[in-house]
C-alpha cells in the first residue's frame, strides 16, 4: 500500500493523483519537441537539449537539477571523406558504390547535421577481397560455415544480415573467424513486415534505409578509455591500443537496395538451408566470391571514421524523500539519438518528462515521496551506454549503499500490440499488482485491466493466468545498475506481436525515418500506448519510492532460481559420461536453492507480521530487501568480464541483448565438447557451480534473522 507520513493526502489518493496527472497530449507535445532536429551524442544540439530539459525539470518542481559531464570516446564519420563500399573490377575501377546517405524523409530535406549511416567505432581501413555471406553472423552461423561447410573466412570480407543478436557480437564473431571487414545489412525478411508499406506510407523500412549503431564489445566497461572509473577532468586515459572493446576490422552498414547489388553476384556454396535465405531476389550463396562471369570482381570498403574524446552531458534531477532521503529510486532513460529519435529514445524521454511533470505537480501541492527519486536523462547511450555508466562509476559508493531500484525508460514503444516487461524477480509482484490496477489501452479490452490484456496476448510459458516477464539482458542503460552494482532493475514498453511479426526490433530502428510522424501516424496516433507505458513506469517508481515496505517479493527469486538450476543441470546432463568421469555434481547448487527457498519463505512470513510502526525494524527489513539483489554480486565478476558481476544474470556472451541465467556455468559448458583440454574445461564447470552455489547460499543468509 502506498503511504507517506509527510503528507495528509490519503495513500490511495497519492498514487491516483500521480497517475491521473499523466496526460497523453503532453507526451505527444514533448515527443514533437524532442524530435525536430538530430540530437547525436557529443553535438551542440544535444547539449542544448540537455539544458532545455534541466530548465524544464526545474520548472516542473524538482528540488535540484544538475548537468553531469564526462569526456568519453565517441566515433564520427569524416565529413569530407565519406564511408562507402565498392564493387571493383580487375582493373580496380569502382563499378558500383553503396549510398553515401539515406534519402531524407518528406519535410526533412533541409535539415542539417544528419549523420550518415555508419558503424560507430569502426577502425579506418580500405580492405578489398572476396565476399562471404554469413547469415546473421551468430556463433552458430560461424559453426555451420567453418565446421560443417568447411568455409574459411580468413582474409575475406563478410556480409551479415542485421537481426537476432546485437551487432557487436556479429563483429566479434567475424573477427574471431579471421575476416578483414564486415558489411552489415537489413534484409526485408527481418525489417519489412508483409502487407505494410515503406515509410513514409507505412512503418516498414525502405530500400535506402540503414540501421546505424555501435559495434563495441564493452562488456559493461563504459567509456573505452577509462574502464571502472569516471571519465572526469583528472582521468587517466588508456591509449587507443589498450581501449576496451574496440573492433579491429572495418565495419559498415547498408540498406537492402545496396545489399541486393552485392548479394546478387554471389557464387560459391549454396545456402545450407532455408534459414539462411532472406527475402531478396538473390540466391543467398555463401561464397566465397562472386559467380563465374563476375569472379574477377572484388569488394572494397572505404572507411574513414574517427574516434574522438568528446564531452557528454547527463541531466540528473532530484526529488528529495521526506522520510528516507538516503534511499534512491532512479528513473533513467537516454536523450541522445542517432538522428531524430522518434522512437529511440524520445518516445521514452517524452514519457519521463511527463512523469517528472506529474511528480512535480504533486510536490508543488505539498507532497513528497517517502524515498528520494532521482531522474536521469542519459547521454551517449548509443555509443555504449556511456553516460549512465560513467555517472554510476562516479557515484558507485552512494549507489551501492543507497540504491533501492532502477527503472529504465528508453523507447516506450517497439510496437502497439501488448506490454513487454523485463525485470528482476523481486519486481514481479509489483508489476502484477500495478498492471491489475491500470486500464488496458488495447482494442477489444475496453473496461479490462492491463494485466488481463497483457496476460491474454503474452502468456507466461510456465504459469497459466500470468503474463510473460523476461530476464534482463543488456543493450540499455540499466546495465551498470543491475549487472555491475546489483541494484534491482526493471524496464517496460509496448511491443509487437512476436508470433506474427518475425522481424528484428522494429523496421525503422536507428534509421533517418524514425521521426515524430512515424509514431503519430502509424504507431500511436492517440498516444494511448505511451500513456500506458508512462503509467507502468511511473507507477513502479511511485510504489518503490513511497510504499512503507519495499514492494519486493523474495519468494519469486526462489522460484526462478530453481527453474534456472534445473535448466543448467539439464544442459550439463547432455554430457553424462563426462559428468561421471570428472565427478561433476550440482548437489551444492540445488541445496543452496532449497535453503534460499526456505529462508525466503520465513522472511516473507516475518514481513507480514513485524511492527511497521517501529522505524528501526522497518528499516532493517527494508534493507534486507534492498540488499538482496546486491547479494548476488560477485566482486570478482565473471570470467574475462569483470564488470558483469551478477551471478544469476548476465548478458549472453553470444548476444548482448539477451539475458542468460547462471552465466558462469552456462559459458563454462558452452561448446565444451570442442575444448582441447576436457579436464580443464570440466574443472571450470565445477568451479562455476561452486561460485553459484556459494552466492545463492550467501544471498539466502542475508534474509535470515539478523541475530
Amino acid at each position: 500500500k502506498s503511504s507517506n507520513e509527510a503528507t495528509n493526502i490519503t495513500p490511495k489518493h497519492n498514487m491516483k493523483a500521480f497517475l491521473d496527472e499523466l496526460k497523453a497530449e503532453n507526451i505527444k507535445k514533448f515527443l514533437y519537441n524532442f524530435t525536430q532536429i538530430p540530437h547525436l551524442a557529443g553535438t551542440e544540439q544535444n547539449f542544448q537539449l540537455a539544458k532545455q530539459i534541466q530548465s524544464q525539470w526545474k520548472e516542473f518542481g524538482l528540488d535540484s537539477v544538475e548537468l553531469a559531464h564526462y569526456d568519453v570516446l565517441l566515433s564520427y564519420p569524416n565529413k569530407t571523406h565519406p564511408n562507402y563500399i565498392s564493387i571493383i573490377n580487375e582493373d580496380g575501377n569502382e563499378i558500383f558504390n553503396t549510398s553515401l546517405f539515406e534519402p531524407p524523409p518528406p519535410g526533412y530535406e533541409n535539415v542539417s547535421d544528419i549523420v550518415p549511416p555508419f558503424s560507430a567505432f569502426s577502425p579506418q581501413g580500405m580492405p578489398e577481397g572476396d565476399l562471404v555471406y554469413v547469415n546473421y553472423a551468430r556463433t552458430e552461423d560461424f559453426f555451420k560455415l567453418e565446421r560443417d561447410m568447411k568455409i574459411n573466412c580468413s582474409g575475406k570480407i563478410v556480409i551479415a544480415r542485421y537481426g537476432k543478436v546485437f551487432r557487436g557480437n556479429k563483429v566479434k564473431n567475424a573477427q574471431l573467424a579471421g575476416a578483414k571487414g564486415v558489411i552489415l545489412y537489413s534484409d526485408p525478411a527481418d525489417y519489412f513486415a508483409p502487407g505494410v508499406k515503406s515509410y513514409p506510407d507505412g512503418w516498414n523500412l525502405p530500400g535506402g534505409g540503414v540501421q546505424r549503431g555501435n559495434i563495441l564489445n564493452l562488456n559493461g566497461a563504459g567509456d573505452p578509455l577509462t574502464p571502472g572509473y569516471p571519465a572526469n577532468e583528472y582521468a587517466y586515459r588508456r591509449g587507443i591500443a589498450e581501449a576496451v572493446g574496440l573492433p579491429s576490422i572495418p565495419v559498415h552498414p547498408i540498406g537492402y537496395y545496396d545489399a541486393q547489388k552485392l548479394l546478387e553476384k554471389m557464387g560459391g556454396s549454396a545456402p545450407p538451408d532455408s534459414s539462411w535465405r532472406g527475402s531478396l531476389k538473390v540466391p543467398y550463396n555463401v561464397g566465397p566470391g562472386f559467380t563465374g562471369n563476375f569472379s574477377t570482381q572484388k569488394v572494397k570498403m572505404h572507411i574513414h571514421s574517427t574516434n574522438e574524446v568528446t564531452r557528454i552531458y547527463n541531466v540528473i534531477g532530484t526529488l528529495r524523500g521526506a522520510v528516507e532521503p538516503d534511499r534512491y529510486v532512479i528513473l533513467g532513460g537516454h536523450r541522445d539519438s542517432w538522428v531524430f529519435g522518434g522512437i529511440d529514445p524520445q518516445s521514452g524521454a517524452a514519457v519521463v518528462h511527463e512523469i517528472v511533470r506529474s511528480f512535480g505537480t504533486l510536490k508543488k501541492e505539498g507532497w513528497r515521496p517517502r524515498r528520494t527519486i532521482l531522474f536521469a536523462s542519459w547521454d551517449a547511450e548509443e555509443f555504449g551506454l556511456l553516460g549512465s555508466t560513467e555517472w554510476a562509476e562516479e557515484n558507485s559508493r552512494l549507489l551501492q549503499e543507497r540504491g533501492v531500484a532502477y527503472i529504465n525508460a528508453d523507447s516506450s514503444i517497439e510496437g502497439n500490440y501488448t506490454l513487454r516487461v523485463d525485470c528482476t524477480p523481486l519486481m514481479y509482484s509489483l508489476v502484477h499488482n500495478l498492471t491489475k490496477e491500470l486500464k488496458s489501452p488495447d482494442e477489444g479490452f475496453e473496461g479490462k485491466s492491463l494485466y488481463e490484456s497483457w496476460t491474454k496476448k503474452s502468456p507466461s510459458p510456465e504459469f497459466s493466468g500470468m503474463p510473460r516477464i523476461s530476464k534482463l539482458g543488456s543493450g540499455n542503460d540499466f546495465e551498470v545498475f543491475f549487472q555491475r552494482l546489483g541494484i534491482a532493475s526493471g524496464r517496460a514498453r509496448y511491443t509487437k506481436n512476436w508470433e506474427t511479426n518475425k522481424f528484428s526490433g522494429y523496421p525503422l530502428y536507428h534509421s533517418v525515418y524514425e521521426t515524430y510522424e512515424l509514431v503519430e501516424k502509424f504507431y500511436d496516433p492517440m498516444f494511448k500506448y505511451h500513456l500506458t507505458v508512462a503509467q507502468v513506469r511511473g507507477g513502479m517508481v511511485f510504489e518503490l519510492a513511497n510504499s512503507i515496505v519495499l514492494p519486493f517479493d523474495c519468494r519469486d527469486y526462489a522460484v526462478v532460481l530453481r527453474k534456472y538450476a534445473d535448466k543448467i543441470y539439464s544442459i550439463s546432463m547432455k554430457h553424462p559420461q563426462e559428468m561421471k568421469t570428472y565427478s561433476v555434481s550440482f548437489d551444492s547448487l540445488f541445496s543452496a536453492v532449497k535453503n534460499f527457498t526456505e529462508i525466503a519463505s520465513k522472511f516473507s512470513e516475518r514481513l507480514q507480521d513485524f511492527d511497521k510502526s517501529n522505524p528501526i525494524v522497518l528499516r532493517m527489513m527494508n534493507d534486507q530487501l534492498m540488499f538482496l539483489e546486491r547479494a548476488f554480486i560477485d566482486p570478482l565478476g565473471l570470467p574475462d568480464r569483470p564488470f558483469y558481476r551478477h551471478v544469476i544474470y548476465a548478458p549472453s556472451s553470444h548476444n548482448k541483448y539477451a539475458g542468460e541465467s547462471f552465466p558462469g556455468i552456462y559459458d563454462a559448458l558452452f561448446d565444451i565438447e570442442s575444448k582441447v583440454d576436457p579436464s580443464k574445461a570440466w574443472g571450470e564447470v565445477k568451479r562455476q557451480i561452486y561460485v553459484a552455489a556459494f552466492t545463492v547460499q550467501a544471498a539466502a543468509e542475508t534474509l535470515s534473522e539478523v541475530a
Epitope: 549510398s99 553515401l100 534519402p103 531524407p104 530500400g207 534505409g209 545496396d258
Partner: nanobody
Framework: EVQLVESGGGVVQPGRSLRLSCAAS????????MNWVRQAPGKGLEWVAF????????YYADSVKGRFTISRDNSKNTLYLQMNSLRAEDTAVYYC????????????????WGQGTMVTVSS
C-alpha cells in the same frame, strides 16, 4: 506542381562543349535517382546517363562514355549534363527524367519527364 525544366540546349560545333541543366520543383530532388534521355530526329528514345540520389553511382550509355558527365546539386534542386567533344550524332532533344523509386541504386522506371531541350551539333 511537380515538374522538370531543362535548359542549356542550342547549336554547337562538333568537338565543342555544352552544359545542360534541369531544374526540379514540387518534389525533393535529393531523394531520387535522375536520368538524361535523348531522342534524335526521327529516332526512338535513347537513355544517356543516370546519377543516384546521393551521387555515389553514375552510369552512361556506351555512346557517350568518357565524353559526358552527369552531376547534381541537391541544394539547388538541379541536375546537370556536361557534354564534351560533341559529335553530329549527339544531335537530339535531351530530356531529364526522374526515377520512380526513392533511393534506387540503378536506373529504374521513370515517372516524371521534362519538356526537353534541343541540342544541335553542326558545323
Amino acid at each position: 506542381e511537380v515538374q522538370l525544366v531543362e535548359s542549356g540546349g542550342g547549336v554547337v560545333q562538333p568537338g565543342r562543349s555544352l552544359r545542360l541543366s534541369c531544374a526540379a520543383s514540387g518534389f525533393p530532388l535529393i531523394s531520387y535517382g535522375m536520368n538524361w534521355v535523348r531522342q534524335a530526329p526521327g529516332k526512338g528514345l535513347e537513355w544517356v546517363a543516370f546519377i543516384s540520389y546521393d551521387g555515389s553511382n553514375r552510369y552512361y550509355a556506351d555512346s557517350v562514355k568518357g565524353r559526358f558527365t552527369i552531376s547534381r546539386d541537391n541544394s539547388k534542386n538541379t541536375l546537370y549534363l556536361q557534354m564534351n567533344s560533341l559529335r553530329a550524332e549527339d544531335t537530339a532533344v535531351y530530356y531529364c527524367a526522374k526515377d520512380r523509386i526513392v533511393g534506387a541504386r540503378v536506373p529504374d522506371a521513370f515517372d516524371i519527364w521534362g519538356q526537353g531541350t534541343m541540342v544541335t551539333v553542326s558545323s
